[in-house]
């Protein structure tokens, strides 16, 4: 990940002092109430403080901002817009802050924002323009290089009447603003599928983490344009088999390493091509750990040890002979 300063020699602001002078204009580089600041490390930490909104008086020097473990609920448009702007802010961590809504333009006026972590927030409403800031068909490029969105799926009863996958992808693709994104983490989001157009519009990706989802198939997903992709994490999904088109695309990426552990591979006749490919490829990391889950007779067999005779399909019986 990107190099970020570790905080040292933090100064805390005294809450009673801050409240006593809240009517005054903020001092240039004071530390917000309930936060710890280190100008030397250019870091502000407002962690586990049950904050309900982003502090207004963030110091202009802040480069790394931790707002984790709070109760923010909603991130409005221009949540970090300040005069003068927070021109140095490069890394923003909002994980575990009970956010359920991120509105359009929430991260506008942060010209240096390279790394954003929204993990562990139940995002029932992520605006399509949360990252692009505008509804133009082509927006100004976002400076984001790393976007961490692990476990942002809300409880089922809090989801809108729309596809969660679709909501996230709409935010990733709006205005083509994230063309410079190099790391995207979408682990633990109960994704059932990956919309086919999402990867084609993120050509700079080096690392993509889709682990611990519920992906059943990659048949309609194209990796062809991801020339720079180096790691693709697909562990702990519901993948049954990878078909020839996917295998060929992955093999064609010059730097790719794929992680496929803990998927319920179905070792029948449809698996033959994948087994042949696994035996030859250097793309898959830990390929010797991949085992069959189905059918029952194949359970726990190592994929690399299978041969074509092992991979059969039960004949399809005519309807008159089928039993329930």
């Amino acid at each position: 990940s990107s190099p970020t300063s570790s905080a040292s020699s933090f100064s805390s602001s005294a809450p009673f002092l801050a409240s006593a002078v809240s009517a005054q204009p903020p001092l240039p580089d004071q530390c917000p109430a309930l936060c710890e600041c280190s100008e030397a490390a250019r870091t502000v930490k407002c962690v586990n403080r049950n904050l309900t909104e982003v502090p207004t008086d963030l110091p202009a020097y802040v480069r790394n901002l931790f707002l984790t473990g709070n109760q923010l609920a909603v991130l409005p448009a221009g949540a970090f817009a300040r005069r003068p702007p927070l021109a140095e802010l490069a890394a923003l961590n909002l994980s575990g802050s009970r956010l359920d809504e991120v509105r359009a333009g929430a991260f506008e006026h942060l010209p240096s924002l390279r790394q954003l972590d929204l993990s562990h927030n139940p995002l029932a409403d992520l605006s399509p323009f949360a990252f692009s800031g505008s509804n133009a068909s082509v927006s100004a490029p976002s400076p984001l290089v790393e976007l961490i969105l692990n476990h942002i799926v809300p409880p089922e009863d809090e989801r809108q009447n729309r596809s969660f996958e679709g909501m996230v992808v709409a935010a990733l693709l709006a205005g083509r603003a994230l063309q410079g994104l190099r790391r995207l983490e979408l682990a633990s989001n109960h994704f059932l599928y990956l919309p086919r157009d999402v990867l084609a519009q993120l050509p700079s990706l080096r690392h993509l983490d889709l682990s611990n989802n519920s992906l059943v198939s990659l048949t309609y997903v194209s990796f062809r344009n991801l020339t720079h992709l180096e790691s693709l994490h697909l562990e702990d999904n519901a993948l049954k088999v990878l078909h020839n088109g996917t295998l060929a695309e992955l093999q064609g990426l010059p730097h790719i390493r794929v992680f496929l552990d803990n998927n319920p591979w179905v070792c029948d006749c449809h698996m033959a091509d994948m087994v042949t490919w696994l035996k030859e490829t250097e793309v898959v990391q830990g390929k010797d750990r991949l085992t069959c889950a189905y059918p029952e007779k194949m359970r726990n067999r190592v994929l690399l040890e299978l041969n074509s005779a092992d991979l059969d399909c039960d004949p399809i019986l005519p309807p008159s002979l089928q039993t329930s």
Partner: antibody, heavy 117, light 113 residues
Framework: QSVEESGGGLVQPGGSLRLSCAAS????????MSWVRQACGKGLEWIGI???????YYASWAKGRFTISRDNSKNTLYLQMNSLRAEDTAVYYC????????????WGQGTLVTVSS | AQVLTQSPSSLSASVGDRVTITCQSS????????LSWYQQKPGKAPKLLIY???TLASGVPSRFSGSGSGTDFTLTISSLQPEDFATYYC?????????????FGGGTKVEIK
């Protein structure tokens, strides 16, 4: 986390030498790694790079004579140098590339190679 | 091959001075901002100062800053300190269909006036 070069020394023109770079604190196979050299009193000169899965790229002048490889089990990077010339005399550095940005964020202290008869 | 031209090749300055070094690339660096700056002191390995054209590396004092995009880049030291007398190098990363290429500028030696 650190990298340490070794294998430098005196070699005759036309000779060969293999430099090593041992990584500690991180897995070499997870990073791109590069070799850079610097002749005495001169600037830095990029030699080549090896990607995480093993693809290699070289400066045009280094192609054919210099080869970068890696032994993941030993967590070691290598630079094989053949047909050495006097102008190859330099300090040779190995450097790790950031996992996100294309920048050298970890350098060894270098090993001196002298090509002379 | 891509060429990075640094200027000046050397300069003399005093403690407290504002110092500016420029780096010009013969073609755009990858993604227009894959340009890094390093500081090197005699007998030592280079040290990363700035990456991605303008992002300060961890632990680097904020008197160092970088700017630029595409082919033209600048390193600025806002107030020169005694420990800043060293040689500075820019480094660009390039990508084409045939793969990756890296290049260094010729260096700028910052000396005490």
């Amino acid at each position: 986390q650190s990298v340490e070069e070794s294998g430098g020394g005196l070699v005759q023109p036309g000779g060969s030498l293999r430099l090593s770079c041992a990584a500690s604190g991180f897995s070499l196979s997870s990073y791109w790694m590069s070799w850079v050299r610097q002749a005495c009193g001169k600037g830095l000169e990029w030699i080549g790079i090896i990607a995480g899965r093993g693809s290699t790229y070289y400066a045009s002048w280094a192609k054919g004579r210099f080869t970068i490889s890696r032994d993941n089990s030993k967590n070691t990077l290598y630079l094989q140098m053949n047909s050495l010339r006097a102008e190859d005399t330099a300090v040779y550095y190995c450097a790790r590339v950031s996992s996100i940005y294309y920048t050298f964020n970890l350098w060894g202290q270098g090993t001196l190679v002298t090509v002379s008869s | 091959a891509q060429v990075l031209t640094q200027s000046p090749s050397s300069l003399s300055a005093s403690v407290g001075d504002r110092v500016t070094i420029t780096c010009q690339s013969s073609q755009s660096v990858y993604s227009n901002n894959e340009l890094s700056w390093y500081q090197q002191k005699p007998g030592k390995a280079p040290k990363l100062l700035i990456y991605y054209a303008s992002t300060l590396a961890s632990g680097v004092p904020s008197r160092f800053s970088g700017s630029g995009s595409g082919t033209d880049f600048t390193l600025t030291i806002s107030s020169l300190q005694p420990e800043d007398f060293a040689t500075y190098y820019c480094q660009g990363s390039y990508y084409s269909g045939s793969g990756w290429y890296y290049a260094f500028g010729g260096g700028t030696k910052v000396e005490i006036k």
